[in-house]
Interface confidence: medium
């Protein structure tokens, strides 16, 4: 459960996150499992640990192996394992299956392709995108933040999409590429006024100060893959990106699912290290589509420690 597969290409940057999570204040120690040798934290090393992250700058085939991370708090230790494999660069265009991230599917109405793992890196826009090794050109393709949008998706748009970006570490630049398959579904469907399944209107969510909290905004929009549908969070009526609190982040990418034949989207809001002032904010789950907008408001309250222990 607490082991994670990670892979990369030689001479590219690879950053791996410890599968065990902890507060930012907790220390994380990394070891090379085969030798139990500690991974250094000094950034002058090609491979070094930086809190929850293990950085290969750049990676080498010899780095392949299992790495152990131990999250240490005053009261407990948690152990996780990162199974890292570094591959030689292919001379031809084919991207082998073992280098592919999860397949995403889209349709004529929904065509975002997210660049895998990019949130681990210190990168700046724009992303470069390639399909079957060819650079994407034309007005139908738009690189937006960490995803690619394809307007008017057609069956011919199916294929392997590679994002390429530059990771910057202390002034040094390292290339990173990641590839995933994109499949196209052709379907007709109905569009309904959005129905928010969670959270309930005016819900009070109990949280513990100092712990992490997740809020999920989930809504259904009709039958079939939906065009012009979005779910998002706002804080005190402001978009998360404009609010400017780095501890509170919206997950990049909306997860699409189907419930009783209805197309649903969800967006997770992650609050790290909950603070007292977070209890004063209004959290709005917004669901929008071409018919309009629905809004459910959530507020946070302090969880009673006695309830927690019982």
């Amino acid at each position: 459960k607490f082991s994670k597969q990670s892979w990369g290409l030689e001479n590219e940057a690879l950053i791996v996150r410890c599968p065990r999570q902890g507060k930012p204040s907790y220390t994380v120690d990394w070891y090379y499992s085969q030798t139990n040798k500690s991974i250094p934290t000094q950034e002058r090393n090609r491979v070094f640990a930086s809190g929850q992250l293990l950085k290969f700058l750049p990676a080498a085939v010899a780095d392949s192996g299992i790495y152990t991370c131990i999250v240490r708090s005053p009261t407990f230790n948690r152990t996780g394992y990162a199974n890292v494999t570094i591959y030689k660069k292919q001379s031809d265009c084919n991207v082998p299956d073992y280098l592919m991230y999860s397949t995403v599917s889209g349709s004529e109405k929904n065509s975002k392709i997210y660049c895998p793992t990019i949130d681990l890196y210190n990168w700046t826009a724009p992303l470069e995108w390639f399909k079957n090794c060819q650079a994407l050109q034309g007005s139908r393709y738009r690189a937006h933040k960490s995803f690619l949008v394809i307007d008017n998706v057609m069956t011919e748009d199916a294929g392997d999409y590679t994002c390429k970006f530059i990771h910057n570490e202390n002034g040094a630049n390292y290339s990173v590429t990641a590839t995933r398959s994109f499949t196209v579904k052709d379907e007709q469907g109905f569009s309904l006024f959005p129905v928010i399944g969670a959270p309930a209107q005016n819900e009070i969510k109990e949280v513990e100060i100092g712990k992490n909290a997740n809020l999920t905004c989930s809504a259904c929009f009709g039958k079939g893959t939906q065009f012009l549908a979005a779910v998002l969070w706002q804080l005190n009526g402001t978009k998360i990106t404009d609010f400017g609190e780095p501890r509170i982040q919206q997950e990049e990418g909306q997860n699409q699912s189907f419930s009783n034949g209805l197309a649903c989207l969800d967006m997770v809001l992650r609050i790290a290290d909950v603070k007292e002032e977070d209890l004063l904010l209004q959290y709005d789950c917004l669901a929008l589509n071409l018919h309009g907008l629905r809004r459910h408001t959530v507020r946070l309250s302090r969880k009673n420690p006695i309830d927690h222990h019982s």
Partner: antibody, heavy 118, light 112 residues
Framework: QVQLVQSGAEVKKPGSSVKVSCKAS????????IHWVRQAPGQGLEWMGG????????HYARKFQGRVTITADESTSTAYMELSSLRSEDTAVYYC???????????WGQGTTVTVSS | DIVMTQSPLSLPVTPGEPASISCRSS???????????LDWYLQKPGQSPQLLIY???TLQSGVPDRFSGSGSGTDFTLKISRVEAEDVGVYYC?????????FGQGTKLEIK
């Protein structure tokens, strides 16, 4: 009240492009979809495409694929429709319309006449 | 794409008399939630279209109650109980059940 005000009439040469604007007022711009519908002289209504300003995704009718681009500027509550490689048959009145909880096209702009002539 | 067929294409009516316009779709517009995704729009001479009826039978706010819509599945009707001079224009049905939205060819209502 809810209003959509479009830019003025345009006369264009074949092969050129036209960009029509649609400024919204009286509601929260990013909360509703914006669509573009055209009407050639003496003809019916034809949906060209639409977008939800907050989602960054636009979608177009196949007929206009590759020629039309719909964008939106949330800071000015303005939607734009750009049609390229104009030909004489693109001569029409172009309407922007707001989606809504009632009909698909709840509120309409006053229309922009685009004439394509050499 | 869904094809919407209206009839008649021209409708001369005497003021005070009723009028009826038919609209047929090539596929069902009825959703399992009971809604028919069909709108009716009126375009008066020299004006932009305006929404009259949505979901086949629901009158848009501000529209006179002499207008009514009915039908389900593939067959729909717009009725005007007593036509007034201000009702002249072209009436369009439009389906929003299947992507992309498509309009009927229009019915021109004129006063006799």
């Amino acid at each position: 009240q809810v209003q959509l005000v479009q830019s003025g009439a345009e006369v264009k040469k074949p092969g050129s492009s036209v960009k029509v604007s649609c400024k919204a007022s009286g509601y929260t711009f990013s909360d509703f979809s914006i669509h573009w519908v055209r009407q050639a002289p003496g003809q019916g209504l034809e949906w060209m495409g639409g977008m939800l300003p907050i989602s960054h995704i636009a979608h177009y009718a196949r007929k206009f694929q590759g020629r039309v681009t719909i964008t939106a500027d949330e800071s000015t509550s303005t939607a734009y429709m750009e049609l390229s490689s104009l030909r004489s048959e693109d001569t029409a009145v172009y309407y922007c319309a707001r989606g809504g909880s009632s009909g698909w096209f709840e509120v309409w702009g006053q229309g922009t006449t685009v004439t394509v002539s050499s | 794409d869904i094809v919407m067929t209206q009839s008649p294409l021209s409708l001369p009516v005497t003021p005070g008399e009723p009028a009826s316009i038919s609209c047929r779709s090539s596929q069902s517009l009825l959703h399992s939630n009971g809604y028919n995704y069909l709108d009716w729009y009126l375009q008066k001479p020299g004006q932009s279209p305006q929404l009259l009826i949505y979901a086949a039978s629901t009158l848009q706010s501000g529209v006179p109650d002499r207008f009514s819509g009915s039908g389900s599945g593939t067959d729909f009707t717009l009725k005007i109980s007593r036509v007034e001079a201000e009702d002249v224009g072209v009436y369009y049905c439009m389906q929003g059940a299947h992507w992309p939205p498509t309009f009927g060819q229009g019915t021109k209502l004129e006063i006799k």
